[in-house]
Amino acid sequence: EEELQMIQPEKLLLVTVGKTATLHCTVTSLLPVGPVLWFRGVGPGRELIYNQKEGHFPRVTTVSDLTKRNNMDFSIRISSITPADVGTYYCVKFRKGSPENVEFKSGPGTEMALGAKPS
């Protein structure tokens, strides 16, 4: 049985204020059943960045087509970057539970930092 891997290829992503940042995340299996969510930070105080199923995330778009079948690409784009967006971003697989989903596996994280302003 293939064990699920959460792949976040970039350890560090340098971004520019006002631009769009792309955070990559791919998975190697559709199992276990359950959604993938994006967070900034870890622990109980982490911030939910994107949940495709519910919520309103006006600055976030998905890289893959949301009508695509059996999607394994959970990359996102965050527009209009500000200094407040810096931090480490994690894509996290949840296992479907009833009533609550349970965290199953997290990617290694991508640190978003501000790069030098273009001259």
Epitope: L66, K96, S98
Partner: antibody, heavy 120, light 108 residues
Amino acid sequence: DVQLVESGGGVVRPGESLRLSCAASGFSFSIYAMSWVRQAPGEGLEWVSTIGADDTYYADSVKGRFTISRDNSKNTLYLQMNSLRAEDTAVYYCAKDSTVGWSGDFFDYWGLGTLVTVSS
Amino acid sequence: EIVLTQSPATLSVSPGERVTFSCRASQNVRSDIAWYQQKPGQAPRLLIYAASSRDTGIPDRFSGSGSGTDFTLTISSLQSEDFGVYYCQQYYDWPPFTFGGGTKVEIK
């Protein structure tokens, strides 16, 4: 081509057991969730159970009596049915789950079904 | 549990006619609806998923629409091979996955 072939159906008495099998081919069996859906004679479709990796889900009507399992080395899905009742009489379909977007499962391929009859 | 109500229960139609099926959910399911066709003695066949996306190989006379609680499956011009029973299914909130009771399409 995706193929799902069920077997193991038959006639049993109330309280007895039966084990259904579903042989799958034509896709990467181990990375997909799989389900059983049943249809009583002349009735509509009723979801029975789904299995992911080792995560399993059941309809209330079968919880505690039915057990879904899979053997990825054999590309086979199973449904162990214990304490069978007359109301379990149905055609049992094996179905491959498909996801869309970032979550949400439906059934994109179905087997032809196997008939289970529970009668005294 | 989300209840899906399909109407009408039966439709009597002539080939070439436009046919519309309704599926109403007891609560918001966004666009997490699939439609299946089942012919007598056969397994169900996926037609539409995500409310409006046609499955591979499904003729374009089949179309789906709707979001929230009200969904529609339309066959623009019914062919003789389209007779059978049509089911909707929700996958927004499960377990359990739930199906509508079906709409039977018969020859007028």
